[in-house]
């Protein structure tokens, strides 16, 4: 569909005569009839197959034609066609004299014709005008013409219909050849799909308008390329949604169980060496001169009462020094210069000669000790506390402060590691010398029977509408990850549809 346009520019009839040579009275009131038809090698009369058009009277004798619609006519003249433009044509332009106001062919005498021109040729669709001038013996006509496509028609022969649109059924304009050209940000056969933010993950992201990136369930981040870990995951990551893969040193379903207390908390003081010994459990190996669970206590070297025979101990930077009483000598005052004759035994101790009187030994009564029975018994001297327990004097009695994992008056009892019921899912606990062991029931494994191996809450396919099922090991239940458009614990409800309850 298109329009053949003819622009009349100037008509010259200086003598004001008709084709017959007869003059017009008073002058030639001139109007035009145009006939457009298919190509003919020799243009002949007959039907104007492509259309006809007439003008009103445009002037008298010689005149220029204004480029407008004056007098009710139109310039350029429009000859619309509703077919594919063939690229060739024939054109007949007749100039007529109108003696009266009636311009109908039947109302005019045959000799009212002023001039007739006929041309034919090729003409491509386009915006450019072709200028032409036709001269006869008495007249001259200057005009130009072109073929353009009607609104919504495109292509070399105006055969391609295209109506631009910008709504949910398409976002496009029409190219000169009639093909669609998507508006910026749109793609697809009819430009109905928005182009998402550059880099938006193809599967995990989508968009409802251009340059957007909306994440599908289980994904997050600007480009929807980061999975969402299991709800409550503390020290873990995921590679697919709802996972919780623990960082080094962490364990448990939510990666919230500290398996590397030493590194995370540095509990050992004063340069002690820390060893992990289970969940939230550790042992400090103290450097010389320190004691306590965390090696937080500084040991005085005199605390172990190294001086014998009533010698007094003095702490020094690099150790200690014993001040011996008269009659004794040696690093710990262990050597005596006395004999039983000197009554060296105190507190009722009895003296016994040794080495032919060169030496002696005191036999002390109860509650006294020392080479000369000079010390009241320190109940901690015998180091009665087992398993590294710390002995504390409490007047006439003593008390052991036990290290973690031991109990009893003398820390002689190993606390059962099984007392805390550490084995999950009904596992049986066995105490070992340095730890415990779990014997797991069928379907579970791992140090604490925490790993489910065969019994799976997802095995029964409880999720509807192609939802993805994840097993929650902490509760023996499942979690359904719903696809777009569904909600509910089993993804059984389409979005917008409330569940129907039986009551």
């Amino acid at each position: 569909s298109g329009v053949f346009q003819l622009q009349l520019q100037e008509f010259i009839n200086e003598r004001g005569v008709l084709a017959s040579g007869r003059p017009c009275e008073p002058g030639c009131r001139t109007f035009f009839r145009v006939c457009l038809k298919h190509f003919q090698a020799v243009v002949s009369p007959g039907p104007c197959t492509f259309g006809t058009v007439s003008t009103p009277v445009l002037g008298t004798n010689s005149f220029a034609v204004r480029d407008d619609s004056s007098g009710g006519g139109r310039n350029p003249l429009q000859l619309p066609f509703n077919f594919t433009w063939p690229g060739t044509f024939s054109l007949i332009i007749e100039a007529w004299h109108a003696p009266g106001d009636d311009l109908r062919p039947e109302a005019l005498p045959p000799d009212a014709l002023i001039s007739k021109i006929a041309i034919q040729g090729s003409l491509a669709v386009g915006q450019n005008w072709l200028l032409d001038e036709q001269t006869s013996t008495l007249t001259r006509l200057r005009y130009s013409y072109r073929v353009i496509c009607s609104d919504n028609y495109y292509g070399d022969n105006c055969s391609r219909l295209c109506k631009k649109r910008n709504d949910h059924f398409g976002h496009y304009v029409c190219q000169p050849d009639g093909n669609l050209s998507c508006l910026p940000g749109w793609t697809g056969e009819y430009c109905q799909q928005p182009i998402c933010l550059s880099g938006c993950h193809e599967q995990n992201g989508y968009c409802s308008k251009p340059a957007e990136c909306l994440c599908r369930p289980g994904w997050q981040g600007r480009l929807c390329n980061e999975c969402i870990p299991h709800n409550g995951c503390r020290h873990g990551t995921c590679s697919t949604p709802w996972q919780c893969t623990c960082d080094e040193g962490w364990g448990g379903l939510f990666c919230d169980q500290d398996l590397n207390y030493c590194t995370h908390h540095s509990p050992c003081k004063n340069g002690a060496t820390c060893s992990n010994s289970g969940q939230r459990s550790y042992t400090c190996t103290c450097r010389p001169g320190y004691t306590g669970v965390d090696c937080e206590l500084e040991l005085s070297e005199c605390d172990s009462n190294p001086c014998r025979n009533g010698g007094s101990c003095k702490d020094q930077e690099d150790g200690y020094h014993c001040l011996c009483p008269p009659g004794y000598y040696g690093l710990h005052c262990e050597h005596s210069t006395l004999s039983c004759a000197d009554s060296p035994c105190f507190n009722g101790g009895s003296c016994r000669e040794r080495n032919q009187g060169a030496n002696y030994a005191c036999e002390c009564p109860p509650n006294f000790t020392g080479s000369n029975c000079e010390k009241k018994v320190d109940r901690c001297t015998s180091n009665p506390c087992a398993n590294g327990g710390q002995c504390l004097n409490r007047g006439p009695s003593r008390m052991c402060r036990c290290r973690p994992g031991f109990t009893g008056t003398y820390c002689e009892l190993h606390v059962s590691d099984c007392a805390r019921n550490p084995c999950a899912h009904g596992g049986t606990c066995h105490d070992l010398e340095n730890g415990l062991m779990c014997t797991c029931p069928a379907g579970f494994s791992g140090r604490r029977c925490e790993v489910r191996t065969s019994i799976d809450a997802c095995a029964s396919s409880p999720c509807f509408n192609r939802a993805t099922c994840y097993t929650d090991l902490s509760t023996d239940t499942f979690v359904c990850n719903c696809p777009y458009g569904f909600v509910g614990s089993r993804c059984e409800f389409p979005v917008g549809l409330p569940p129907s309850f039986p009551w």
């Epitope: 109506k163 910008n166 009819y190 109905q192 989508y206 777009y484």
Partner: antibody
Framework: QVLLIQSGAEVKKPGASVQVSCKAS????????VIWVRQAPGQGLEYMGW????????NYAQKLQDRVTMTSDTSTTTAYMELRSLRSDDTAVYYC??????????WGQGTLVTVSS | SYELTQPPSVSVSPGQTARITCSGD??????AYWYQQKSGQAPVLVIY???KRPSGIPERFSGSSSGTMATLTISGAQVEDEADYYC???????????FGGGTKLTVL
């Protein structure tokens, strides 16, 4: 071949809701839209709305905007139309159809919804 | 609200040309689509984008559009063409889509 299979007939009371499903097969679901059209007994076709199967964008007929919801599930290639607050004049055959560039080239078989007290 | 107007009925004898019109203010800028619906059946697309014919639709069906009027032409109508015909289009904004009221074609 392209098929759109709709859910079965429904009888509902005034004020209730109805959901009609439209299971698509034989083509790439997310490359097309789905439109819903209804036809009351002895009456003409009435456009209800459109949904993009790719991203869930919707366009609803003004008259039904407050009562209709259209959704789609790419995992099951199924479109849904829910109509709430049903009235007797909602009694009709409800059709879904595949849409591309505003052409509705394949249609479901239709679902009769009867609203009666 | 936007409307598309169709004649309620058109009658032709077999072999004659049937013309069904559809008028709407936005049709100069918006495409018209034509659907055929036979009794008790789902509609079938017979013309899309004013003038295009889907594969499988007989050549006797053609479409045209001029100004605010779209026309479905059935050249040499046959008895099996007896059906209701609906035009479909959108308003100028593209937000409101409507079917025409439908035209019952009788071929007798």
């Amino acid at each position: 071949q392209v098929l759109l299979i709709q859910s079965g007939a429904e009888v509902k009371k005034p004020g209730a809701s109805v959901q009609v499903s439209c299971k698509a097969s034989g083509y790439t679901f997310t490359n097309y839209g789905v439109i819903w059209v209804r036809q009351a007994p002895g009456q003409g076709l009435e456009y209800m709305g459109w949904i993009s199967a790719y991203n869930g964008n919707t366009n609803y007929a003004q008259k039904l905007q407050d009562r209709v919801t259209m959704t789609s599930d790419t995992s099951t290639t199924t479109a849904y139309m829910e109509l709430r607050s049903l009235r007797s004049d909602d009694t009709a055959v409800y059709y879904c159809a595949r849409e591309l560039g505003s052409s509705f080239d394949y249609w479901g078989q239709g679902t009769l919804v009867t609203v009666s007290s | 609200s936007y409307e598309l107007t169709q004649p309620p009925s058109v009658s032709v004898s077999p072999g004659q040309t049937a013309r069904i019109t559809c008028s709407g203010d936005a049709l100069p800028k918006k495409y018209a689509y034509w659907y055929q619906q036979k009794s008790g059946q789902a509609p079938v697309l017979v013309i899309y984008e004013d003038i295009k014919r889907p594969s499988g639709i007989p050549e006797r069906f053609s479409g045209s559009s001029s100004g605010t009027m779209a026309t479905l032409t059935i050249s040499g109508a046959q008895v099996e063409d007896e059906a209701d015909y609906y035009c479909f289009s959108t308003d100028n904004s593209g937000d409101h889509s409507v079917f025409g009221g439908g035209t019952k074609l009788t071929v007798l």
